[in-house]
């Protein structure tokens, strides 16, 4: 069985999620990469992806999501700026490698966004809200269309564990029904 781990991030509205997904440099440097959300009982949904082939350290922006693929470091950097409560959920990075199925990168990200104080008051109109306005100068890449080859399975359950320290991991064992999403060009 596949052992999946999650890292939990608890942030406030208006803050930035800034994470990395490591990949094997020689194997995947120029492969197209994507940032997906996994909602319970649904297929993973691609929110943003790099260009094809993926360009080195070339920012790709889709709405509030910014992807940067650092080929020389073997990592995909994902930033979600000006977070909203609705952004809460389980996320993952994948590598598109047609005609093969996408390759999932570890670890998954459990994002919890709450209202309230995020360094600067967010709800008070008289105060300065920590909302970063992104200049629309980056590239918006088109992500491949995909479909599930079989019935949608239940996504990993939301953790009820108390994850209070940054080092905490949620270990999901016996997850054999990971959704594989082949790419159709």
């Amino acid at each position: 069985a596949t052992k999946l781990t999650e890292e939990k991030y608890e942030l406030k509205e208006g803050q930035t999620l800034d994470v990395k997904c490591d990949y094997t440099l020689e194997k995947f440097a120029s492969s197209q990469k994507a940032w997906q959300i996994i909602r319970d009982g649904e297929m993973p949904k691609t929110l943003a992806c790099t260009e094809r082939p993926s360009k080195n350290s070339h920012p790709v922006q889709v709405g509030r999501i910014i992807l940067e693929d650092y080929h020389d470091h073997g990592l995909l950097r994902v930033r979600m700026v000006n977070l909203q409560v609705e952004d809460s959920g389980l996320y993952q990075c994948v590598i598109y490698q047609p005609p093969k199925e996408p390759h999932m990168l570890f670890d998954r990200i459990r994002l919890v966004v709450t209202k309230g104080f995020s360094g600067t008051p967010g709800s008070n109109e008289n105060s300065t809200q920590n909302v970063y306005k992104i200049p629309p100068t980056t590239t918006k890449a088109l992500c491949p269309l995909y479909t599930s080859p079989r019935t949608v399975t239940q996504a990993p359950p939301k953790s009820t564990a108390d994850v209070s320290t940054p080092d905490s991991e949620i270990n999901l064992t016996n997850v054999t029904d990971i959704i594989r999403v082949p790419v159709f060009n």
């Epitope: 803050q15 490591d22 360094g119 992104i134 940054p166």
Partner: antibody, heavy 121, light 105 residues
Framework: QVQLVQSGAEVKKPGASVKVSCKAS????????IHWVRQAPGQGLEWMGW????????NYAQKFQGRVTMTRDTSISTAYMELSRLRSDDTAVYYC??????????????WGQGTLVTVSS | SYELTQPPSVSVSPGQTASITCSGD??????VSWYQQKPGQSPVLVIY???KRPSGIPERFSGSKSGNTATLTISGTQAMDEADYYC????????FGGGTKLTVL
Amino acid sequence: QVQLVQSGAEVKKPGASVKVSCKASGYTFNGYYIHWVRQAPGQGLEWMGWLNPNSGGANYAQKFQGRVTMTRDTSISTAYMELSRLRSDDTAVYYCARDQRKTTVTPFEYWGQGTLVTVSS
Amino acid sequence: SYELTQPPSVSVSPGQTASITCSGDKLGERQVSWYQQKPGQSPVLVIYQDNKRPSGIPERFSGSKSGNTATLTISGTQAMDEADYYCQAWDRNVVFGGGTKLTVL
């Protein structure tokens, strides 16, 4: 608990090389980046680069490109930083530090005790 | 190359509030960390993700960010808080601010 233990102080002559070690314990060594940061006497913190222990890949600050090499020996959970062509202004305390999480590059939650490298003729 | 700017020094009386700023281009879309360093010691993480405190860090330490400026605030400053403080962010590489010497008068 997580610990990073560094090798002892070194005295080197200009033009020589130095190799500092950082032994990790209390966690899975492969899972977290190791960074190297130096601090010259009376100066601030200067990031030198990171090492991905899983792949062995490294990323160096531009200032040190061509002079620094970061490696690891996973069998003994130890990271190394070698700096060559030493100059007197390389005299500094050299720290190794570990990422807080697997999925981030910063912050550095755990630090070694530091290794003083003195470059003098 | 990316730079983070801090004031070289800040002075505060015991019991008062000390504020140390850190500014940088596009800091609004980056997460900021703060470190405390006392003479002869390794740095200690005091704030991460703009405003979170690691366990063991006193509640008097707090962080905030507005636009492209991050602020470390120490309320009810104590003599033991006298140290150098560094901000940090990740651009393409990891960057530290120049450091601020906090003096408790």
